[in-house]
Amino acid sequence: EVEKTACPSGKKAREIDESLIFYKKWELEACVDAALLATQMDRVNAIPFTYEQLDVLKHKLDELYPQGYPESVIQHLGYLFLKMSPEDIRKWNVTSLETLKALLEVNKGHEMSPQVATLIDRFVKGRGQLDKDTLDTLTAFYPGYLCSLSPEELSSVPPSSIWAVRPQDLDTCDPRQLDVLYPKARLAFQNMNGSEYFVKIQSFLGGAPTEDLKALSQQNVSMDLATFMKLRTDAVLPLTVAEVQKLLGPHVEGLKAEERHRPVRDWILRQRQDDLDTLGLGLQGGIPNGYLVLDLSMQEALS
């Protein structure tokens, strides 16, 4: 048997082209110079290499760059990116948004893989913060990206970046995440007029405190029930019946359908039944007339 480690005569690759698809795997390994491959990475995606052949090419790059690929190679990886492990990606230093976009494009339409998550993590850490352009890019590819971050990570999002956030980007955020994002959104949109402000701030309201909800109730915003149901329970409880009525406007009728669910259920328990009756919705469960309500939390604060 011929020892299959040396490149056969006349098979040395002069450039990365279509002729290589009929090279055996061992011939690719023996006949394609890794440095040539690195400089012509952009050509690889145009050539229908098999899955196995791509593994050979990756192996060649790994041997050439044991400490991690340079960005000039990373930017042109294309489908070869799908072969990278999180361990490979942790060795990279990706600073260009164009590189990030190029690699996210390869994974487009698929869920965020461990590779993509690692890539984004490396990129954001390298930049020091989630700037607007980065957030724009990430949420365009992965609408749920923002809600995958911890509250600590979200704290590095500058208020200016909030302009890139769309309502659907916040669909899977939990209250802890909205607690961090809401003050940033409030700051970002502070110069907008009433109705425009409400449109922008609406999806962040799951992080709003009571005083902000009270202020909104004075602005005829007509909050829909879906938004109301996502509000923090502790922020809703202190609202009076009149304030909730003003906050919801014509949508107040929807309270009846939600009376068994939080935060409506808990809010009802805190209201005087007399006050609830003024809504004419048949809401039951309020404090019976003649009962005295002691706010023990206020008493504790005073003592």
Epitope: T5, K24, K25, W26, E29, Y51, E52, D55
Partner: antibody, heavy 122, light 110 residues
Framework: QSQLVESGGGRVQPGGSLRLSCAVS????????MGWVRQAPGKCLEYIGY???????YYASWAKGRFTISKDNSKNTVYLQMNSLRAEDTATYFC????????????????WGQGTQVTVSS | ALQMTQSPSSLSARVGDRVTIKCQAS??????LAWYQQKPGKPPKFLIY???DLASGVPSRFSGSGSGRDFTLTISSLQPEDFATYYC????????????FGCGTKVTVL
């Protein structure tokens, strides 16, 4: 003289797992690809998958997820982990070496082990 | 997905006959084809690689030809020890395929 000896076969209940081993001698696993092929009684040869010299693995579409090939170069052994076994997995399981010293499956399989019988039934 | 089709599935012949077995790939595989011989209760034996190159120790009465999609294994003068099942195998792409082997051609005594 290259030799391959399979072991680990036997009877297993549906839904069970089994790990087959293929002990090799006469060559190094760091230079050759190693594959697994099975054959049900009276049926065709059925490719399961292979592992290259650098450890990358490739599988038949039907084997992905249930079957896993691995190797330990220092022990000169290749493994086939089989999970969620079904009656239709009953067969003789062969391990085979890639014939080419290039380390990938480029030319075919040669030599082959004698095979180990796996029976899946309750 | 890449598939291999062998024909005929069985054939009967006499000692001394010239026997031809065909194998077709569903897409071009260049010359990345191997042939095997298998006898009952034994593992397959490697006969031919690269569609036409004889493996070590294989008698010269065996020959292979073809490229692209269509391939042929020929036994020029059938010997008693050649009665067996013959399989082709594509080695162009071994990932995520249903099977790399054809389903065999059984050669029996007429």
């Amino acid at each position: 003289q290259s030799q391959l000896v399979e072991s680990g076969g036997g009877r297993v209940q549906p839904g069970g797992s089994l790990r087959l081993s293929c002990a090799v001698s006469g060559f190094s696993l760091s230079s050759y690809a190693m594959g697994w092929v099975r054959q049900a009684p009276g049926k065709c040869l059925e490719y399961i998958g292979y592992i290259s010299k650098i450890g990358t693995t490739y599988y038949a579409s039907w084997a992905k997820g249930r079957f896993t090939i691995s190797k330990d170069n220092s022990k000169n052994t290749v493994y086939l982990q089989m999970n969620s076994l079904r009656a239709e997995d009953t067969a003789t399981y062969f391990c085979a070496r890639g014939s080419s010293s290039g380390g990938y499956l480029d030319d075919g399989f040669d030599p082959w082990g004698q095979g180990t019988q796996v029976t899946v039934s309750s | 997905a890449l598939q291999m089709t062998q024909s005929p599935s069985s054939l009967s012949a006499r000692v001394g006959d010239r026997v031809t077995i065909k194998c077709q790939a569903s897409q071009s595989i260049s010359n990345y084809l191997a042939w095997y011989q298998q006898k009952p209760g034994k593992p397959p034996k490697f006969l031919i690689y690269d569609a036409s190159d004889l493996a070590s120790g294989v008698p010269s009465r065996f020959s292979g030809s073809g490229s692209g999609r269509d391939f042929t294994l020929t036994i020029s003068s059938l010997q008693p020890e050649d009665f067996a099942t013959y399989y082709c195998q594509q080695v162009y792409d071994s990932n995520n395929v249903e099977n790399v082997f054809g389903c065999g051609t059984k050669v029996t005594v007429l």
